[in-house]
């Protein structure tokens, strides 16, 4: 056959769906690869063709759209499973073509099993709630387009394995779950089960997400440098190792880039002809506040190095701070017999 623009296997969209549930999968061509939508393509006389490769097979085969109860169907640019089966797992390809044009992309679809407590290998989206911040909501995700607005589904919410009813500060409100005042104890996996009728059958959609309670912007402060500080003096003799930790606390801030860096005499350490290494470690609190430590180390410090200015800098969306380390050359202790004795007139 003639050449086709092949976008390859789009592993960025690793689609996971639960077994025995409906799934609607849009052809990624129109969302991520082509500059026009399905209706434009359709009205220009292009046809959308679907096929697939089963898991652990190399053979591409057409999708069987003649299964009982139209289990698999296509509607515009959407491939429908009503419902999925475990052996639907594989790589699916959608191809847009006519006699002069062809473009295609493949994507992996994994049908996943869940247990009675909704545990599964499914990768879960994370929703962050601010601690003690007032009412916040999460919404049952990815249920649009499964049923018309005239259909009123029933929605049941679970935390872990437990149905949410009469919880202190968590209230189910249809597609939304409201947290009156989020606390660390609200961390966990939350599942909504959406049940709706279609053509005399009942379908369930299960959606699980992880709630993580994080520091509130109300409590956020600029970075705090705990070390270096005014109480510690790094007193070294030439030839010794100089180790200066820079320890910085960052409040949790959504989408903030936290950075820590050292300057030596106002310059980037790399820019200076000095054998310096910097090692970084990062730890997080339960509310995702961050502590970064960068240890500056000079294996064999020279007297010249001990005169330099060592400054730790830190920056977040809340501001930039800097602190200089107090570095000095150790004065050698006098040798009593020679120096002090001479002072007392000894000969």
């Amino acid at each position: 056959s003639e050449r086709c623009d092949d976008w390859g296997l789009d592993t960025m969209r690793q689609i996971q769906v639960f077994e025995d549930e409906p799934a609607r999968i849009k052809c990624p061509l129109f969302e991520h690869f082509l500059k026009f939508n399905y209706s434009t393509a359709h009205s220009a006389g292009l046809t959308l063709i679907w096929y697939w490769t089963r898991q652990d097979r190399d053979l591409e085969e057409p999708i069987n759209f003649r299964l009982p109860e139209n289990r698999i169907s296509k509607e515009k640019d959407v491939l429908w499973f009503r419902p999925t089966l475990l052996n639907d797992t594989g790589n699916y390809t959608c191809m847009l073509r006519n006699t002069t044009y062809c473009s295609k992309v493949a994507f992996p679809l994994e049908v996943v099993q869940k247990d009675s407590c909704f545990n599964s290998p499914m990768k879960l989206p994370v929703h962050k709630l601010y601690i003690e911040y007032g009412i916040q909501r999460i919404t049952c995700p990815n249920v649009d387009g499964y049923f018309p607005s005239s259909v009123k589904p029933t929605i049941t919410w679970y935390m872990g394995c437990y149905k949410i009813q009469n919880f202190n500060n968590v209230i189910p409100e249809g597609m939304n779950l409201s947290f009156l005042i989020a606390l660390i104890s609200n961390n966990g996996n939350y599942t909504c089960v959406v049940t709706y009728p279609e053509n005399g059958r009942t379908f369930h959609l299960t959606r699980t997400l992880t709630v993580k309670v994080v520091g509130s912007p109300k409590n956020a402060v600029p970075p705090v440098i705990h070390s270096p500080n005014d109480h510690v003096v790094y007193e070294k003799e030439p030839g010794e190792e100089l180790l200066i930790p820079c320890t910085v606390y960052f409040s949790f801030l959504m989408d903030s880039r936290n950075e820590v860096w050292w300057t030596i005499d106002g310059k980037k350490p790399d820019d200076i002809t000095i054998d310096v290494t910097i090692n970084e470690s990062i730890s997080h609190s339960r509310t995702e506040d961050e502590t970064r430590t960068q240890i500056l180390s000079i294996k064999k410090v020279t007297s010249e190095d001990l005169k330099r200015s060592y400054v730790c800098h830190a920056r977040s969306a809340k501001g930039e701070v800097a602190k200089a380390a107090k570095v000095k050359q150790k004065v050698p202790a006098p040798r009593y017999t020679v120096e002090l004795a001479c002072g007392f007139g000894a000969t």
């Epitope: 950075e259 005499d265 106002g266 310059k267 820019d271 005169k307 400054v311 800098h313 920056r315």
Partner: antibody, heavy 124, light 107 residues
Framework: QVHLQQSGPELVRPGTSVKISCEAS????????INWVKQRPGQGLEWIGQ????????YYNEMFKDKARFTVDKSSSTAYMQFSSLTSEDTAVYFC?????????????????WGQGTSVTVSS | DIQMTQSPASLSASVGETVTITCRTS??????LAWYQQKQGKSPQLLVH???TLAEGVPSRFSGSGSGTQFSLKINSLKPEDFGSYYC?????????FGAGTKLELK
């Protein structure tokens, strides 16, 4: 606001030396480099070198390392450049300019504030 | 030392025109390049640092671009106060070098 005030014009004899001052105000003097830049009449800019007041660290352009010497007086937030063995080639306007410190976000050491320049004329 | 090649050496343009000055470096300097403007008898003024970051108070008709070894300064719709000399400078490491300059004159 940041201000760099340079000393006045100098008329000097060949073979002698000259010391130009640059008084800084409006920022923390110790934490920024003071750079020195030469501009001969009708010519471009030449970087002479820099000094870091907090530690007296210096870097010199190879072409000037035997000619220029930088010092600072921390108490008065003033930087000095001494130019020695003067010849007619040293007739120029000399600028001091502030740079750095390095920032993860703003990169390296652009010269963000400049003094008004000191004119040095070497003539017998 | 890093060599800076700035072009053109001089340039004539009219008010309202758009001009571009380029600067090439002898080795990769990432984005550590600054542009300065200098008017006759005055001190230079920082326009752009880190290749594309406008300095405080610089009008948005100025823009810097490039990285590695190729850089440019673009001035959109020239104003009378834009005429003068322009210099590039790498601000990297422990030795800073200026380009030879571009004199922008009124046509």
């Amino acid at each position: 606001q940041v201000h760099l005030q340079q000393s006045g014009p100098e008329l000097v004899r060949p073979g002698t030396s000259v010391k130009i001052s640059c008084e800084a105000s409006g920022y923390i003097f110790l934490t920024y480099w003071i750079n020195w830049v030469k501009q001969r009449p009708g010519q471009g800019l030449e970087w002479i070198g820099q000094i870091f007041p907090a530690s007296d660290s210096t870097y010199y352009n190879e072409m000037f390392k035997d000619k220029a010497r930088f010092t600072v007086d921390k108490s008065s937030s003033t930087a000095y450049m001494q130019f020695s063995s003067l010849t007619s080639e040293d007739t120029a306007v000399y600028f001091c300019a502030r740079s750095g410190p390095y920032s993860y976000y703003a990169g390296g050491y652009a010269l963000d504030y400049w003094g008004q320049g000191t004119s040095v004329t070497v003539s017998s | 030392d890093i060599q800076m090649t700035q072009s053109p050496a001089s340039l004539s343009a009219s008010v309202g025109e758009t001009v571009t000055i380029t600067c090439r470096t002898s080795e990769n300097i990432n984005s550590y390049l600054a542009w300065y403007q200098q008017k006759q008898g005055k001190s230079p003024q920082l326009l752009v640092h880190y290749a594309k970051t406008l300095a405080e108070g610089v009008p948005s008709r100025f823009s810097g671009s490039g990285s590695g070894t190729q850089f440019s300064l673009k001035i959109n719709s020239l104003k009378p106060e834009d005429f003068g000399s322009y210099y590039c400078q790498h601000h990297y490491g422990t030795s800073l070098t200026f380009g030879a300059g571009t004199k922008l004159e009124l046509k």
